[in-house]
């Protein structure tokens, strides 16, 4: 079942519900964090819980089996079904933005390719709810700084349209 923190409006689908492979990660984050990095998976999008669970599994499979990572790289994944999928969660260092940024940021990735379109309103609300949740839980500083993936690494992620969108979010700071 999706779990909902009293301070959050955005439910988080736990790993066991989307049938994640067991994590092999051990590196803990030091909370609260100052940065959030937004990316996209650049793969298929999904708009139902079933298809988003499938997509989360496929991203994790690729990250673990081909890239050799200890888990899916992102701390959280966002589906166009309006749900947040737990990746490494708030406590474990991700593999989303390079060795400099991973230990000091939470990586959230929108499942899909957002070069030419923006995510659904449900997905955007889910991401914003997650960030509010992070602050309420003490995982993110109240004055956290939001970055786009391309702000911290040489990449097209999070896609042109999503990048333009997050630039208007209150915590976004340009490089």
């Amino acid at each position: 079942q999706e779990t909902e923190d009293p301070a959050c409006c955005s439910p988080i689908v736990p790993r066991n519900e989307w049938k994640a492979l067991a994590s092999e990660c051990a590196q803990h984050l030091s909370l609260p964090l100052r940065y959030v990095v937004v990316s996209h998976t650049a793969g298929s999008s999904c708009n139902t819980p079933a298809s988003c669970q499938q997509q989360a599994r496929n991203v994790q499979h690729y990250h673990m089996k081909t890239l050799g990572w200890c888990d899916v790289g992102y701390n959280f994944l966002i589906g166009e079904d309006g749900l947040v999928y737990e990746g490494r969660g708030w406590n474990f260092t991700g593999a989303h933005s390079g060795h400099l940024w991973n230990p000091m940021s939470i990586g959230i990735s929108f499942m899909g390719n957002y070069m030419d379109r923006v995510p659904t309103p449900q997905a955007i609300r889910a991401a914003q709810g997650l960030l509010a949740c992070g602050v309420a839980q003490g995982a993110l500083r109240s004055n956290y700084v939001l970055k786009g993936h391309r702000d911290v690494q040489r990449t097209l992620s999070p896609g042109n349209q999503l990048y333009h969108l997050i630039q208007n979010w209150p915590h976004y700071r340009s490089p």
């Epitope: 496929n58 690729y62 081909t66």
Partner: antibody, heavy 120, light 108 residues
């Protein structure tokens, strides 16, 4: 009953191309990762290609990367392997197999195989 | 890539005998992703044991699997005639996914 039936094998010259097919039935094809595995004349098993349930991700060993392409048609329950620039060392029996997250991607069903011989 | 070395390459056992074959990985493999297949002449491989110790459907209880890290084994508590076959270990821990070269089990 789960069935995987390969076809398309045959004799081909070095440098040539061949397309293998695998017709699946008896299970929800779109829920499973699919694989091609070959068995050499010396009876060694070699994984050749993998494809995610929704075709988003494909995987290959270096030995075939750039020469082989795995694809699937979930509407038709078919798996394919396009092989090009074939070499003598590609001579083998080619099997398609399925795997899913339920048993941690172990290949729980295999077809009967289709034989590919690369020779001049 | 992870190389799987199976030993012995060929072995023979009498009916009723306890049989153990091993699979050694060149680097550590999660036990969740170490599988075994059985193949008989003229047939395709069959999943036999998955995730180190789980018997596939229809596999007799005299078979068992164990191991962790780089060392894994398949054991038959009491050899029967139908167990004569080649057994392959397989790792799905990291791509490229690899197979051992097989252990051929014959009846003595």
């Amino acid at each position: 009953e789960v069935q995987l039936v390969e076809s398309g094998g045959g004799l081909v010259k070095p440098g040539g191309s061949l397309k293998l097919s695998c017709a699946a039935s008896g299970f929800s094809f779109s829920d499973y990762y699919m694989y091609w595995v070959r068995q050499t004349p010396e009876k060694r098993l070699e994984w050749v290609a993998a494809i995610s349930d929704d075709s988003t991700y494909t995987y290959y060993p270096d030995s075939v990367k750039g020469r082989f392409t795995i694809s699937r048609d979930n509407a038709k329950n078919n798996l394919y392997l396009q092989m090009s620039s074939l070499k003598s060392e590609d001579t083998a029996m080619y099997y398609c197999a399925r795997g899913g997250y339920g048993n941690l991607y172990a290949m729980d069903y295999w077809g009967q195989g289709t034989s590919v011989t690369v020779s001049s | 890539q992870i190389v799987l070395t199976q030993s012995p390459a060929i072995m023979s056992a009498s009916l009723g005998e306890r049989v153990t074959m091993t699979c050694t990985a060149s680097s550590s493999v999660s036990s969740s992703y170490l599988h075994w297949y059985q193949q008989k002449p003229g047939s395709s491989p069959k999943l036999w044991i998955y995730s180190t110790s789980n018997l596939a459907s229809g596999v007799p209880a005299r078979f068992s699997g164990s191991g962790s890290g780089t060392s894994y084994s398949l054991t038959i508590s009491s050899m029967e005639a139908e167990d004569a076959a080649t057994y392959y270990c397989h790792q799905y821990h990291r791509s490229p996914f690899t197979f051992g070269s097989g252990t051929k089990l014959e009846i003595k």
